[in-house]
Each structure stands twice: as structure tokens, then as C-alpha cells.
């Protein structure tokens, strides 16, 4: 939980923050986990600790490993781990997946690409920006503070963007590069990981024995037309059609609806003549699309008939 992946390129600066946070007044000790050797704080060292920060100026492939940081306060100690990997510089333009920071999406209305991790460094504007290794030129591109703004975003603007800046430490300059993918969302539509609106996770639904009951599985998948999206019910992890209980049926087809502009699908599960054994089953509402699968579980409980006797 308190471990963080960090990566960089050899001969570039890399600064890593301790995953455990504390007040500025707390002391932070850093160790190289494999040897339990303390990281020095003297700035004359190539690798040194500076409070919450661990600095590699510059980084070397041999620096790769797990570093332990201990945040010490008068009343407690907190331990965190920084898993650092330093890679050799690529000779070609292609940036491998393992050097990529999180993908950001943009649209005509919002096209900011933030330079990852830059807040850890002592840098001065302007940033240099590259797309697929080509320096960005033209009035559509504006380097503003720690982010790039693209005017009139088009689908062609999707790609890998690299920011390059100089970190200054005691008068010495070190280069830093960071790359992330930028995807362009058409304002007319997009898809996202399914969001189940109903039922709530681990919901208990009260039913009356001998009566009919309906359960609705409802999920939203994005805005506009959705490609390969579905909602369905499962019983004890099995498709309704395979479960073999004719009293329990899924509605044919999925009803499409729009909620706050989002494309949603509903699927109703009908249970006829509810029986005691139905209360023992696990009912799963599943919503899936190309982003993945989300599952909400429902259980049935007996609704106590109202006692009319005083």
C-alpha cells in the first residue's frame, strides 16, 4: 500500500518522494533496502536524501532497487518503499510502455497535457515538448507553466508527448524527460468503465415468499452510441439461461436509456413465486464493455408480513 513505482533514464535527474507523508518538521531517513545501508544527506553525493525526497543526480542503471523511507515523529514512525528502476536510454524514437506515465484524454474544450512529476523538481520555464519525438512547432501549441495546451484539438493530435526540462541543484543542471500518451475524445461520444447505478453493492432486497419479485440491473457506459456494452444477471456465478430454474428469467433484450447524457442499459430479472431457496442464491448484476467488467451482488431476504395483532 505504501509502495510507489518510480522510473527514470540513466544520466537524467530523478527525484522520488517518500510514499508516506508527514509534517515538514518530521525527519525522514532513507535506506537502500537490499543492504539496509543509509542514504547520505550530503549534497556532494550523486544519490542523496533531502527530507521527503530522494535525489539521483544523475541516475545510473545500477541505482535500480527498492529504497525504504522512514518518517519519524516524536510519537510514531511510518515506513514507505520506493521501487526505483533506471533504464538505459533508447536509441530509437519509440518510448516503451514501461517508461510511460498515465494516459490523459483531451477534447476540443480541454486539451491540457501536464508534464508528469515536474512538481518534484527545481525547474524554470519554458518546458520543451515533443510528440512522437518531433519538437512541437506551430501556433496551436502553447507551453504554459507545467503543461502543454493544444488549440483546436484534432484526432491527429493523439500520440505520445514528451516534456523535457532542466533541474537545477546547487548551480548544476540536469536534464529530465517524461512521456505520456494523449488520446482525443470526440465531444460527441466516449466510453468509460461501466458504472452500475442499481443495485447498490451488497444490497439486500426484501421479498415476500410466494409473490413475484423484480430486480433491475442498470449501468451507464459513456456518452453516445456504445460499441460492445452489455448488462446481465448471474445466479451463483452462472448465466441465467444455464442455471435451469424456469421461475427465474431475464428480460429479453436490454433497454437503452439516457441519464444525464450518458448511455445506460437496464436488464430486469423476474422471479416468479419466490421460494425459500431463492433467498440462498447470490444474484450478480454484471456490466461490461471494452474497458472491463463491474459486478454488484444482491441477496434476497424475507420481508416480514406486518403483524396486525396488538
Amino acid at each position: 500500500k505504501f509502495s510507489k513505482q518510480s522510473w527514470g533514464l540513466e544520466n537524467e535527474a530523478l527525484i522520488v518522494r517518500c510514499p508516506r507523508q508527514g509534517k515538514p518538521s518530521y525527519t525522514v531517513d532513507w535506506y537502500y533496502s537490499q543492504t539496509n545501508k543509509s542514504i547520505p544527506t550530503q549534497e556532494r553525493n550523486r544519490v542523496f536524501a533531502s527530507g521527503q525526497l530522494l535525489k539521483f543526480l544523475p541516475a545510473a542503471v545500477a541505482d535500480s532497487g527498492i529504497y525504504t523511507c522512514i518518517v519519524r515523529s516524536p510519537t510514531f514512525n511510518r515506513t514507505g518503499y520506493a521501487n526505483v528502476t533506471i533504464y538505459k536510454k533508447q536509441s530509437d524514437c519509440n518510448v516503451p510502455d514501461y517508461l510511460m506515465y498515465s494516459t490523459v484524454s483531451g477534447s476540443e474544450k480541454n486539451s491540457k497535457i501536464y508534464c508528469p512529476t515536474i512538481d518534484l523538481y527545481n525547474w524554470t520555464a519554458p518546458l520543451e515538448w515533443f510528440k512522437n519525438c518531433q519538437a512541437l512547432q506551430g501556433s496551436r501549441y502553447r507551453a504554459h507553466k507545467s503543461f502543454l495546451v493544444i488549440d483546436n484539438v484534432m484526432t491527429e493530435d493523439a500520440g505520445d508527448y514528451t516534456c523535457k526540462f532542466i533541474h537545477n541543484e546547487n548551480g548544476a543542471n540536469y536534464s529530465v524527460t517524461a512521456t505520456r500518451s494523449f488520446t482525443v475524445k470526440d465531444e460527441q461520444g466516449f466510453s468509460l468503465f461501466p458504472v452500475i447505478g442499481a443495485p447498490a453493492q451488497n444490497e439486500i432486497k426484501e421479498v415476500e415468499i410466494g409473490k413475484n419479485a423484480n430486480l433491475t440491473c442498470s449501468a451507464c457506459f459513456g456518452k453516445g452510441t456504445q460499441f460492445l456494452a452489455a448488462v446481465l444477471w448471474q445466479l451463483n456465478g452462472t448465466k441465467i439461461t444455464d442455471f435451469g430454474e424456469p421461475r427465474i428469467q431475464q428480460e429479453e433484450g436490454q433497454n437503452q436509456s439516457f441519464s444525464n447524457g450518458l448511455a445506460c442499459l437496464d436488464m430486469v430479472l423476474r422471479i416468479a413465486d419466490v421460494k425459500e431457496e431463492d433467498l440462498l442464491l447470490q444474484y450478480d448484476c454484471l456490466a461490461l464493455n471494452l474497458h472491463g467488467l463491474r459486478r454488484h451482488t444482491v441477496r434476497l431476504s424475507r420481508k416480514n408480513p406486518i403483524d396486525h395483532h396488538s
Partner: antibody, heavy 126, light 107 residues
Amino acid sequence: EVQLLESGGGLVQPGGSLRLSCAASGFTFTDAWMNWVRQAPGKGLEWVSTISVSVGVTYYADSVKGRFTISRDNSKNTLYLQMNSLRAEDTAVYYCATIGSMATIRKGATDAFDIWGQGTLVTVSS
Amino acid sequence: DIQMTQSPSSLSASVGDRVTITCRASQRINSYLNWYQQKPGKAPKLLIYAASTLQSGVPSRFSGSGSGTDFTLTISSLQPEDFATYYCQQSYSTPPTFGGGTKVEIK
């Protein structure tokens, strides 16, 4: 290495049946949406069917609905296409292909057919 | 269903030529457009997805553009290994549909 390997093609008479298999390896099978795409001799590509491997939701082209059944065996990492009531117009090379099985998801390619098998020829003729 | 129309259906070109293939959708499909290359006797290969993003390992001489209904695949400098048939495909809605293909032949 990411790989799809089809088998089961052959010559069958009109009205007959055939079951195609596609063995998948090198990626997490249950993360994928698996597909069958066919190509009649000298013609273009036509999507046939899709299944979500994780839960088995299925989609079919109108031209095969009610005659073809797509299924999978997660324990064997294998995709199937059961073809019944075959017609001459079903003659084609049948490819299995994945959607959303690769690291390309990071870059939004989840809706493209990103991995293809080598194909298996189905000939329907008397 | 969304119809995809490719043009031309075939073209002749020489090594080093710049080649452009167009694909038109019967309705707006935003950027949900993919391009494939197929050589005789082989399976199709994904070249470009999301209208303009190059699939990993595909040479940079290939590029895609367009949004909405009109899309273009461009080969900036045709190489001997590029002689093949190219297909566009929409993934905006089910069923996914392909264009009829464009055969690029040696002049």
C-alpha cells in the same frame, strides 16, 4: 508470444455442420473480447460474431444469427464457432481475432481487431 | 448498420510514391475508425486505430487522419512490402463493418 491458432475448417455439404476452434496463447484470455471474421474467396472482410470471454455475452451478424453459435472454454483458452445449416455463401476463410487483449488498451485501441489468427478455410459445396 | 465505402477499389503506384486511400462512413463515427493491411494468403494486420494512432511496430510512413464521416490512410513513400490490400473498419457501433478494400498494385 501472442498467438491465435484456428482449426476445424474443411469441406462440408450444404445443410451440414462444422465446428471451428481457435486456441489462444500469450495473453490473458478472460480480458479479451473474441471474434470470428470471415473472408469469402476474392472478397472483403465480414464480421461474424463476438463473445466477451469473461461472462459470455454474445453478438452475431444477421447473416448467421440462429445458425452459428460462438462459445469459449476458459480453462482451455479456446474459442469455438459451431456452424449449422451451412450454405454455399458461408464458404470463406474464417479468422479468429481479439479486441482489447493487449497493452494497446493504454492507448485506446480497445475497439480494434488487434490480433488475428492465420485463418481456416470452410468450403460449403455439394 | 453503418456502411463503409472505400475508394479507390484499386490503384497502381511505384516505389517511393505517396499513396492516399479514403474511407467514408454512412453516418458520423467520430474517430472510431481502424485501418488494416492484408497480403495475399495472410491474415489482416492492424495498422492504425482511433483514426490516427499508429499501432506498435508499424512504420511511420503510414498515417491516418479524419473524423466524423471522412477518413484517409496515407503512405508517404511506398515501399515494396506495402503492396497489399487495405481495409477500413468502424468500431462506433455493433455490428462492426469493413470497407470493401483498396488493392495497391505495382505500376
